[in-house]
């Protein structure tokens, strides 16, 4: 069986301030078991945007029913975008454990924020 891949098809997305941004992410396998997390940026300074497992992420909604066992689409929508949201977003698969460990990351999607049209 082929190893899981995390696919972020869009290299970049541009959104006007105040609008919503859709960031696409799919995985190619249900194995290994474990949650998806979204981050803005890479390395230790990265910001947690969404954690499928726990937490309260009011501006983020999942595009599909990510809680379904067979789901492989982990795309998200971020509402009310501001300039501070600009950056590269990574969809990251974790392997279930105590604690969960990072398994594989997508290539990233760069979000740029345009001025709100007047």
């Amino acid at each position: 069986e082929e190893e899981l891949q995390v696919i972020q098809p869009d290299k970049s997305v541009s959104v006007a301030a105040g609008e919503s941004a859709i960031l696409h992410c799919t995985v190619t396998s249900l194995i290994p078991v474990g949650p998806i997390q979204w981050f803005r940026g890479a390395g230790p300074a990265r910001e947690l945007i969404y954690n499928q497992k726990e937490g309260h992420f009011p501006r983020v909604t999942t595009v599909s029913e990510s809680t379904k066992r067979e789901n492989m689409d982990f795309s998200i929508s971020i509402s009310n975008i501001t300039p501070a949201d600009a950056g590269t977003y990574y969809c990251v698969k974790f392997r279930k454990g105590s604690p969960d460990t990072e398994f594989k990351s997508g290539a990233g999607t760069e979000l740029s924020v345009r001025a709100k049209p007047s």
Partner: antibody, heavy 119, light 108 residues
């Protein structure tokens, strides 16, 4: 219910150090950025520092940069502020504040810890 | 760096009357503005976020309006327990996070 409880305040002399703690409960601490905000006697609110959810990203106000260090222990649900080379102008009540989401407002505040720097 | 200017510095209002507080940003902050209430000797408390949304447990006599650079907090019928300092906070551009200088609401 969300609770934020600061401790570690006190009276110190200029140039000395102090470490504040903020014990958090009632929410998923490791999922939220946290902040320190201070208020000098009779003055308004001044943002001091921010730390991202994982602890690897930090920001500071220019007035404390190089002297204060923010950190967190997600296993203990605790936020810290290490304050070195304290000055009289650092005298204030220090509040820890939870951030609603990573790029958002402060939705819960602690009761505050008083730090007095005086010779 | 965005500067927030609150006016008036002090507002004296009779119980049951309307109080109108203003917060002006030096550049657009979209709808990313919050209002916090601080009663004497207490910690701040979130009242309004995203310019118009009331936080959990906040009475409906508090309302927020505005977008861009001009924002208003309205207390429709002032109660004695509303005596406090009110601060606006922007979170459109950061760091640093900025607060306004505050408006003190006194009961006549």
């Amino acid at each position: 219910d969300v609770q934020l409880v600061e401790s570690g305040g006190g009276v110190v002399r200029p140039g000395e150090s102090l470490r504040l703690s903020c014990a958090a409960s009632g929410f998923s601490f490791s999922s939220h950025a946290m902040n320190w905000v201070r208020q000098a006697p009779g003055e308004g609110l001044e943002w001091v520092s921010r730390i991202n959810s994982g602890g690897g990203g930090t920001d500071y106000a220019e007035s404390v940069k190089g002297r204060f260090t923010i950190s967190r222990d997600n296993s203990e649900n605790t936020l810290y502020l290490q304050m070195n080379s304290l000055r009289a102008e650092d005298t204030a009540v220090y509040y820890c504040a939870k951030q609603y989401d990573w790029n958002g407002f402060f939705d819960y505040w602690g009761l505050g810890a008083l730090v007095t720097v005086s010779s | 760096e965005t500067v927030l200017t609150q006016s008036p510095a002090t507002l004296s209002v009779s119980p049951g009357e309307r109080a109108t507080l203003s917060c002006r940003a030096s550049q657009t902050v979209g709808s990313k503005l919050a209002w916090h209430q601080q009663k004497p000797g207490q910690a701040p408390r979130l009242l309004i976020y995203d310019a118009t949304n009331r936080a959990t447990g906040i009475p409906d006599r508090f309302s927020g309006s505005g977008s861009g650079t001009d924002f208003t907090l309205t207390i429709s019928s002032l109660q004695t327990e509303d005596s406090a300092v009110y601060y606006c906070q922007q979170y459109y551009y950061w760091p640093p996070y900025r607060f306004g200088g505050g408006t003190k609401v006194e009961i006549k």
